[in-house]
Amino acid sequence: FERTRSLQDPCSNCPAGTFCDNNRNQICSPCPPNSFSSAGGQRTCDICRQCKGVFRTRKECSSTSNAECDCTPGFHCLGAGCSMCEQDCKQGQELTKKGCKDCCFGTFNDQKRGICRPWTNCSLDGKSVLVNGTKERDVVCGPSPADLSPGASSVTPPAPAREPGHSPQ
């Protein structure tokens, strides 16, 4: 089948990094600067992703593969393939529409992203507070006074990413 296709379509012989140039009798021409083709048999090369603004280049574009971007320092990626960047905050803060704000009393955030979450309520598990919570850290629950068995620290899942799109002021 492959041989038959080659006889019928000369473009199928054009390798990645080239395109089948209809203006030049369907010969394989190299992709122009700032473009690429990652598969063979392409009739055009795609323009490379440009990493600028809040994005920076993680991998340069080549004739056979697209550029890859990540975020500049002070920002983190959101979405598939780092489709957007969001401003970092300090631990103990969360990102709001007005910028980074400290976690309210009774909540914490131990990451540079995500939202402030309530401290664990130790009493719900019949335990007592062993170490008080802070803006940056959850409380540590210990055994209740009546409980002689050793207490276990509470484990909290990582904070989910907040809805993207707050600009740095």
Partner: antibody
Framework: EVQLVESGGALVQPGGSLRLSCAAS????????MDWVRQAPGKGLEWVAD????????YYVDSVKGRFTISRDNAGNSLYLQMNSLRAEDTAVYYC????????????WGQGTLVTVSS | EIVLTQSPSSLSASVGDRVTITCQAS??????LNWYQQKPGKAPKLLIY???SLQSGVPSRFSGSGSGTDFTLTISSLQPEDFATYYC????????FGGGTKVDIK
Amino acid sequence: EVQLVESGGALVQPGGSLRLSCAASGFTFTNFWMDWVRQAPGKGLEWVADINKDGGEKYYVDSVKGRFTISRDNAGNSLYLQMNSLRAEDTAVYYCARDAMRGGDLDYWGQGTLVTVSS
Amino acid sequence: EIVLTQSPSSLSASVGDRVTITCQASQDIRNYLNWYQQKPGKAPKLLIYAASSLQSGVPSRFSGSGSGTDFTLTISSLQPEDFATYYCQQSYSTPGFGGGTKVDIK
């Protein structure tokens, strides 16, 4: 409140020069890339140029490369567009705009300044 | 150059109508697509960024969808202040705008 105010538009002869300014206020200017976008009378929007936070990185649309220079003065919270060898097709309202620093969208725009190139 | 083709170039609608504007990119631009509204004599205003995220302060009747090459801006119930020209813009590579869609009163 974020504000961008352009100035410097004028009537200029073909081949002449002009310098546009954009005064920024209400935000930390040094935290943002800035752009120039233009709109010819009765036509659509055309991106012209942008510049990074410290002024070391600049990009231009092909039609103005070698003729226009984008620059910024971070101490004075100002953006500039130096336009040389002006042509009739450069006639447009020129807007300065702020890159939102999240995905390449322009979240604040000035009111625009009109550049007319005619003899 | 990545070309953005908007359709229709103009449309007439009535208050309360559902309006849909499309923008087609000449190649895959993932979700690097933004929408702006412009009224005569005024600067453009950002409505939607990253294909579907609503800009702060923009009414929820505006929504965006799509990824890759095909994108849509929808106004669920047209209001008198929505009569304007709408532009799509790609920020995947060297920025570029679509030709615009003028929405006027039927």
